[in-house]
Amino acid sequence: MAVTACQGLGFVVSLIGIAGIIAATCMDQWSTQDLYNNPVTAVFNYQGLWRSCVRESSGFTECRGYFTLLGLPAMLQAVRALMIVGIVLGAIGLLVSIFALKCIRIGSMEDSAKANMTLTSGIMFIVSGLCAIAGVSVFANMLVTNFWMSTANMYTGMGGMVQTVQTRYTFGAALFVGWVAGGLTLIGGVMMCIACRGLAPEETNYKAVSYHASGHSVAYKPGGFKASTGFGSNTKNKKIYDGGARTEDEVQSYPSKHDYV
């Protein structure tokens, strides 16, 4: 029973995690304009992996897709790749794990096959989660580097009367969604791997016993006797002033209210 619960819980946790990774990848708020210690603007900028958006205080939002592929920073491309790999592995893992679930009967599938599938999906979830966490972390590191660079620029070259306010970007909601989702997928994968141990039939090796009969001796070699243990006992059960359908094309949304404090 514990194995089924662990496997089922692992599947559900991974499912939530992968849904989160997909959501994070699609979200526009990977980086958002830093409002702290800045003059209050009536325009709010935020950027995703696929497009950048500008929300005017009046309520209009305009988004523009990154139509270039070669012109994008290598780091952004790497983050995109990591997130997509994470989604693909996660999706395959989900597909495999559905058939591996102990509570689902598919033909005369043996427990050994289910165990192998559970382990495979578990590993896939772990790698998927790691890809998401890596992708989000790379992007976050990029933001931190750029933030301090633009902060340094803000306090240089301001001798003249006219000042230029540098737009600084900080962590957006998608980063936190990505980290949590990646962590959940990772945990789900670990749970699947633990469940696999309980599903796998154990091999019991009997030591060779020599019989000295009159005439010639016969040695019985250890055979491949398999004991089906059923539910393993070795498994463990472990949460300003105050600032739409989208296409890759430029989009303007219906007005909505935004505050800036």
Epitope: V40, V43, V54, V162
Partner: antibody, heavy 118, light 113 residues
């Protein structure tokens, strides 16, 4: 079409208060910020503040905080500006204007003249 | 607060003449997110409310004659009237739409010779 109809001319005594109205029609009143502006005779325009009728949220120009109070009534699609402790400095034409694309005042009321005189 | 400086304060012109008026802001009104300048131009005729002509520094509001052209970026902006008509005689204001509080220039008065 979008229309903003403001209340008529006001003649008030110093120290008194006045409430100017701006009735909107022809658009989704709750979904656009309404701005209020002041124009003294022969002078430029000053932004007083803005209100979002959808939830009553407001932003004020620091120079008018305490002087002006902005409110809105969703049911009658009307925005109001209450001016208190009036002095001769408050004698001006007051405009309401809808906030549109590009953070611009795209439609304006005809203006309400307020004269403070004893 | 952002200071908007307009020049000249008044202009005396003749019909069909080309007119250029300037507006300078104390801080850049350029937003890198959408590559747009948050400056608008308004026209105000005597006894009337201001009327929006140009937004995003160079985008004409629908219904505005094409003789009105806005240009500039960052801190320096211009409004050009290619061929002045009698009905264009008014006061023209530039406005900062980027920073709170929203501020206006003192205006450029266009008069007929």
């Amino acid at each position: 079409q979008v229309q903003l109809q403001q209340s008529g001319t006001e003649l008030v005594k110093p120290g008194a208060s006045v409430k100017i109205s701006c009735k909107a029609s022809g658009y989704a009143f709750n979904s656009y910020w309404m701005n209020w502006l002041k124009q003294r005779p022969g002078k430029g325009l000053e932004w007083i503040g803005q209100i979002y009728p959808g939830d009553g949220d407001t932003n004020y120009n620091g120079g008018f905080r305490g002087k002006a109070t902005l409110t809105a009534d969703k049911s009658s699609r009307t925005a109001y500006m209450h001016l208190n402790s009036l002095t001769s400095e408050d004698s001006a034409v007051y405009f309401c204007a809808r906030w549109g694309t590009g953070n611009t005042m795209d439609y304006w009321g005809q203006g309400t003249s307020v004269t403070v005189s004893s | 607060d952002i200071v908007m400086t307009q020049s000249p304060s008044s202009l005396t012109v003749t019909a069909r003449e080309k007119v250029i008026m300037n507006c300078k802001s104390s801080q850049s009104l350029f937003n890198s997110g959408n590559q747009k300048n948050y400056l608008s131009w308004y026209q105000q005729k005597p006894g009337q409310p201001p009327k929006l002509l140009i937004y995003w520094a160079s985008t004409r509001k629908s219904g505005v004659p094409d003789r009105f052209t806005g240009s500039g970026s960052g801190t320096g902006f211009t409004l050009t009237i290619s061929s002045v008509q009698a009905e264009d005689l008014a006061v023209y204001y530039c406005q900062n739409n980027y920073f709170y509080p929203l501020t206006f220039g003192a205006g450029t008065k266009l008069e007929l010779n």
